[in-house]
């Protein structure tokens, strides 16, 4: 806390300008009117205040707006944003995407701080859902943002937002998140034709069920091995050798290099060796000829 002291004669600030960097902390407290500061917040960023001086300016704003800053002030906080605590930010009502962008810019290049996480949470909750423009903005600043959300939070993502998602935005998503995002992507891209559709849906296929992989295998999509390796093991296991061959097209040869890794390894174990031999890749580990295969999962479903 800065002690309350009278402003020395002639030092009362008429506007926010560079002369204030020579003020001591107590002089800033005494001589800068909080209302003036609020109306001229856009100037603060251009002035090289010390961290201690920024603390004083924040204190003045806190006193002026005990219930939380108005958006007109928030939009121009600049580096003062770094002084805010998550508790401060929870009092805000940020509705403008421009305000969000301005504050994210301040933190650019750094990990997502608790302040930024709180700001984003407030913004998204205020909007009611994660719309396309917001998602576009957030993934531009934080490519891993989407994968930081819980499956429950992802469920409120409207399909139109999926158009903003780039393949790298999904790199850190786990299967539970892709399970939620994949149906959204299917909805979003449903008006596209075969080849265009596959290009767009490819990044989300880690959430695809067996039925969809079977349907895709009929479309001559030529899935690459990197995509195939990201598919859900439980979705790949029921695929026949012929279906995998159709799904991968010319990339089927890559199975040999991946035969010890999931899901390829587990899939091989489920196939008849005779069927695997038809690929001519030397894949080993299939069910020997003459053995009976009991699908217990199917039996459970029927009982």
């Amino acid at each position: 806390e800065v002690e309350k002291t009278a402003c020395p004669s002639g030092k009362k600030a008429r506007e926010i300008d560079e002369s204030l960097i020579f003020y001591k902390k107590w002089e800033l407290e005494a001589c800068v009117d909080a209302a003036l500061l609020a109306t001229q917040m856009d100037r603060v960023n251009a002035i090289p205040f010390t961290y201690e001086q920024l603390d004083v300016l924040k204190h003045k704003l806190d006193e002026l707006y005990p219930q939380g800053y108005p958006e007109s002030v928030i939009q121009h906080l600049g580096y003062l944003f770094l002084k805010m605590s998550p508790e401060d930010i929870r009092k805000w009502n940020v509705t403008s995407l421009e305000t969000l962008k301005a504050l994210l810019e301040v933190n650019k290049g750094h990990e997502m701080s608790p302040q930024v996480a709180t700001l984003i949470d407030r913004f998204v909750k205020g909007r009611g859902q994660l719309d396309k423009d917001t998602l576009d903005t957030l993934t531009a600043f934080y490519p891993g943002y989407l994968c930081s959300l819980s499956p429950e939070e992802l469920s409120s993502v409207p399909p139109s937002s999926i158009w903003a998602v780039r393949p790298q935005d999904l790199d850190t998503c786990d299967p539970r998140q892709l399970d939620v995002l994949y149906p959204k992507a299917r909805l979003a891209f449903q008006n596209m034709n075969g080849s265009e559709y596959f290009v767009k849906i490819q990044s989300f296929l880690g959430g695809a069920p067996t039925e969809d992989l079977k349907a895709l295998s009929q479309q001559n999509v030529s899935m690459d091995l990197a995509t195939f390796m990201k598919l859900r093991t439980d979705a790949v296991l029921p695929l026949t050798v012929a279906e995998v061959q159709k799904l991968l097209g010319p990339h089927v040869e890559g199975l040999k290099a991946e035969e010890r890794h999931r899901p390829v390894r587990d899939w091989i174990l489920r196939q008849r060796q005779d069927d695997l031999d038809t690929l001519g890749l030397g894949l080993q580990g299939g069910i020997p000829n003459g053995y009976l295969v009991l699908d217990l999962s199917m039996q459970e479903a029927l009982s």
Partner: antibody, heavy 122, light 106 residues
Framework: EVQLVQSGAEVKKPGASVKVSCKAS????????VHWVRQAPGQGLEWMGI????????TYAQKFQGRVTMTRDTSTSTVYMELSSLRSEDTAVYYC???????????????WGQGTLVTVSS | SYELTQPPSVSVSPGQTASITCSGD??????ASWYQQKPGQSPVLVIY???RRPSGIPERFSGSNSGNTATLTISGTQAMDEADYYC?????????FGTGTKVTVL
């Protein structure tokens, strides 16, 4: 033949909630997307939302956002649609419909329930 | 919000061809579906993805979609085809149904 069997008619007071169920008979596998569509008396069809086969992903029409919740019990092959804060304008027949037609990017509704009349009246 | 407009009614003589239009901004860039609904019954899908017929739907039902208009054609119309017909398409985050057309077989 595959059928979707819906719960019976409901009469509700304004402000209350209603939960309509839709059970698949003749096919116990939870492999299809399920839509909910409503039709007010003498009016056209209005889409409310969709739930995916595993029940983890839902998409709701903007108009119903915050008021509708769709859930799925895969053990009983039943889908539920709950609508809260009911008003008189919500009086309608509510249909569930499945997308079973073949197609990798297709959600056409080709199997429909018989409909559930929900009347909202004080 | 996206809108699909249909004529309120279309009349056709038995054995003749009925054409029902559905207009919407750049509708040809989207896939259109068509549903038939008879009084007191649930809707029935008759056309999906512009021109594909589900199994069990008679060949006399066909569809097309280009520009701003999708069209459902019923050739050799029968008395049993008398019903309301709704077009439908996906736009942005919702399925939009057309305003509906009552087909009367004279």
């Amino acid at each position: 033949e595959v059928q979707l069997v819906q719960s019976g008619a409901e009469v509700k007071k304004p402000g209350a909630s209603v939960k309509v169920s839709c059970k698949a008979s003749g096919d116990t596998f939870n492999r299809y997307y399920v839509h909910w569509v409503r039709q007010a008396p003498g009016q056209g069809l209005e889409w409310m939302g969709i739930i995916n086969p595993s029940g983890v992903s839902t998409t709701y029409a903007q108009k119903f956002q915050g008021r509708v919740t769709m859930t799925r019990d895969t053990s009983t092959s039943t889908v539920y649609m709950e609508l809260s804060s009911l008003r008189s304008e919500d009086t309608a027949v509510y249909y569930c419909a499945e997308s079973r037609v073949p197609g990798y990017n297709n959600f056409a509704m080709d199997v429909w329930g018989q409909g559930t009349l929900v009347t909202v009246s004080s | 919000s996206y809108e699909l407009t249909q004529p309120p009614s279309v009349s056709v003589s038995p054995g003749q061809t009925a054409s029902i239009t559905c207009s919407g901004d750049k509708l040809g860039d989207k896939y259109a579906s068509w549903y038939q609904q008879k009084p007191g019954q649930s809707p029935v899908l008759v056309i999906y993805q512009d021109n594909r017929r589900p199994s069990g739907i008679p060949e006399r039902f066909s569809g097309s979609n280009s520009g701003n208009t999708a069209t459902l054609t019923i050739s050799g119309t029968q008395a049993m085809d008398e019903a309301d017909y709704y077009c439908q398409a996906w736009d942005s985050d919702t399925y939009v149904f057309g305003t509906g057309t009552k087909v009367t077989v004279l």
